[in-house]
């Protein structure tokens, strides 16, 4: 089943003339109807190029959606076609006509030709269920860390008031189907699962129905589990720096870690002309490490003041936790004070990477 599906019941044709400009026409059609919206030019004058818009998005013509300058036709209408339609002048985006369309599961009754009566007969007083806030139901995937609580909601309305039931992976879902049970609030159109576990993953469908029809929405739940890992260092940090003699420099290192990380700043040095020891380990000096009153935030920044030529070289941010270590390095180039900034930029690019 795809993420977020709505069930559609199909069934036949009504045409509605446009309202006076500035008014909003409330229209109800039966499932399967051909919805025809008419928008004659105001005052009978020339129309100019127009565009039809549904819920703020321009409609794209298709075999089912027929777009004309003064008329929109949607064949074989379904719940998905419910929404706010408007006809606008293409250049100015001025709204010429505005319609609120609701497609119910109740097939239209009466004479096909009698479009206006059709819309009135179906009425808003009685009818199939519809979502009260469809724009808030566009999120279809919920990813939740294990042990937290999940709430799915499908607020709806209809006359008579619809009932709501829930499916998991297409099958009836009841409290006994999960350890810890479920909590239902029919007045809030909600399903609550406390302390979710990986076995709660799946597709959850709310089915809202009354005697005139039914609608449904499917959500997917993913339960996330924590896998321990060594610290993760943000890519690109610390960054290579070029500084003028006597200026101040800051290196930054962003550390992500589940277990409390231990952060150190190291500077690579030479010993007897060699950068590495016999075992291949680089020679380093520790510039900054955790102290009694040092916060992680402070350790993520290495500040060098009044830099000298001796400060030039390679710097490493080393982060470790109970799982392992990670490190990123960057270079500092120190230029004589009299050199131009342009040259400094060029020098920086030499050391990049």
């Amino acid at each position: 089943e795809s993420l977020g599906t709505e069930q559609r019941v199909v069934g036949r044709a009504a045409e509605v003339p446009g309202p006076e400009p500035g008014q909003q026409e409330q229209l109800v059609f039966g499932s399967g109807d051909a919805v025809e919206l008419s928008c004659p030019p105001p005052g009978g004058g020339p129309m100019g190029p127009t565009v039809w818009v549904k819920d703020g998005t321009g409609l794209v013509p298709s075999e089912r959606v027929l777009v004309g300058p003064q008329r929109l036709q949607v064949l074989n209408a379904s719940h998905e076609d419910s929404g706010a339609y408007s006809c606008r002048q293409r250049l100015t985006q001025r709204v010429l006509c505005h319609f609120s369309v609701r497609v119910t599961d109740a097939p239209s009754s009466g004479d096909d030709e009698d479009g206006e009566d059709e819309a009135e007969d179906t009425g808003v007083d009685t009818g199939a269920p519809y979502w009260t806030r469809p724009e808030r139901m566009d999120k279809k995937l919920l990813a939740v860390p294990a042990a937290n609580t999940v709430r799915f909601r499908c607020p709806a309305a209809g006359n008579p008031t619809p009932s709501i039931s829930w499916l998991k992976n297409g099958r009836e879902f009841r409290g006994e189907h999960r350890i810890g049970g479920i909590k239902l609030r029919h007045q809030q159109w909600s399903l609550v699962m406390e302390s979710v576990v990986p076995s709660d993953r799946g597709n959850y469908t709310c089915v809202v129905e009354n005697k005139f029809g039914s609608i449904r929405q499917t959500y997917t739940l993913d339960v996330l589990e924590r896998s321990p890992h060594r610290p993760i260092l943000q890519a690109g940090l610390p960054a290579n720096q070029t500084a003028v003699l006597g200026s101040d420099v800051e290196f930054h290192c962003k550390v992500y870690s589940d277990a409390q990380p231990h952060i150190q700043w190291l500077k690579h040095v030479e010993v007897n002309g060699s950068k590495v020891g016999p075992d291949g380990t680089p020679y380093v000096t520790v510039l900054k490490t955790a102290g009694a009153n040092t916060t992680d935030k402070e350790l993520e920044v290495l500040s060098l003041h009044n830099v000298t030529f001796e400060d030039a070289g390679e710097y490493t941010c080393l982060a470790g936790n109970s799982i392992g270590f990670s490190h990123h390095s960057a270079w500092l180039v120190v230029l004589p004070a009299e050199e131009e900034l342009v040259e400094a930029d060029e020098a920086g690019s030499v050391y990049a990477g």
């Epitope: 808030r136 939740v144 042990a147 799915f152 909601r153 609030r185 809030q188 992500y256 589940d258």
Partner: antibody, heavy 127, light 107 residues
Framework: EVQLVESGGGLVQPGGSLRLSCAAS????????ISWVRQAPGKGLEWVGR????????NYADSVKGRFTISADTSKNTAYLQMNSLRAEDTAVYYC????????????????????WGQGTLVTVSS | DIQMTQSPSSLSASVGDRVTITCRAS??????LAWYKQKPGKAPKLLIY???FLYSGVPSRFSGSGSGTDFTLTISSLQPEDFATYYC?????????FGQGTKVEIK
């Protein structure tokens, strides 16, 4: 069984620092959060801040922002409240509470619920 | 910040009484509201979350209702162990804020 045990409270002078610990057990620490709530003598409850272990994020009340820092060592299942630049008005019993999220498909926010609380530790700021 | 105002601040009742405490938010918090009970010298205990959901292990005489800005905690039949201070708390806005508390005393 879920348990939260605070420690580290005591008497400190204005401007001083103190670090409180909250040792947690009986639940998956890295999936949930720890909130700190305080209660001044004879007063109501005041939310201080929250550590959310899943992404390591923290949130603070305006009254403590910049002075208090919440952190955690997930290998020890322990959360910390580092309190600097303490003031007389910080005098209170400090509670840590296990915090879980209610993730609602319909809402943009996550509702946070504090369901298990420690016994509290008293912090007195006085000269 | 969202202000939470409880009423009454205190009330006297007898065992077996039906008790109602209200909580009003200064702005819409949907159903993001919890109720806590606290006895002197003890830590608070969660009773209700999401305005109307009874937390596990809490007696069914406690119930919560409301959404938006107006909420109610009801104790259908007051028991001796229910004499305590009750707090509401919202967590839709930052920071989370508590009401000032309602003290339920023995009449």
């Amino acid at each position: 069984e879920v348990q939260l045990v605070e420690s580290g409270g005591g008497l400190v002078q204005p401007g001083g620092s103190l670090r409180l610990s909250c040792a947690a057990s009986g639940f998956p620490f890295t999936s949930l959060g720890i909130s700190w709530v305080r209660q001044a003598p004879g007063k109501g409850l005041e939310w201080v801040g929250r550590y959310w272990a899943w992404d390591g994020s923290t949130n603070y009340a305006d009254s403590v922002k910049g002075r208090f820092t919440i952190s955690a060592d997930t290998s020890k299942n322990t959360a910390y409240l580092q309190m600097n630049s303490l003031r007389a008005e910080d005098t209170a019993v400090y509670y840590c509470a296990r915090t879980y999220g209610i993730y609602d498909i319909y809402e943009k926010y996550t509702e946070y619920v504090m369901d298990y609380w420690g016994q509290g530790t008293l912090v007195t700021v006085s000269s | 910040d969202i202000q939470m105002t409880q009423s009454p601040s205190s009330l006297s009742a007898s065992v077996g009484d039906r008790v109602t405490i209200t909580c009003r938010a200064s702005q819409d918090v949907d159903t993001s509201l919890a109720w806590y009970k606290q006895k002197p010298g003890k830590a608070p205990k969660l009773l209700i979350y999401s305005a109307s959901f009874l937390y596990s292990g809490v007696p069914s005489r406690f119930s919560g209702s409301g959404s938006g800005t107006d909420f109610t905690l009801t104790i259908s039949s007051l028991q001796p162990e229910d004499f305590a201070t009750y707090y509401c708390q919202q967590s839709t806005g930052h920071p989370q804020t508590f009401g000032q508390g309602t003290k339920v005393e023995i009449k």
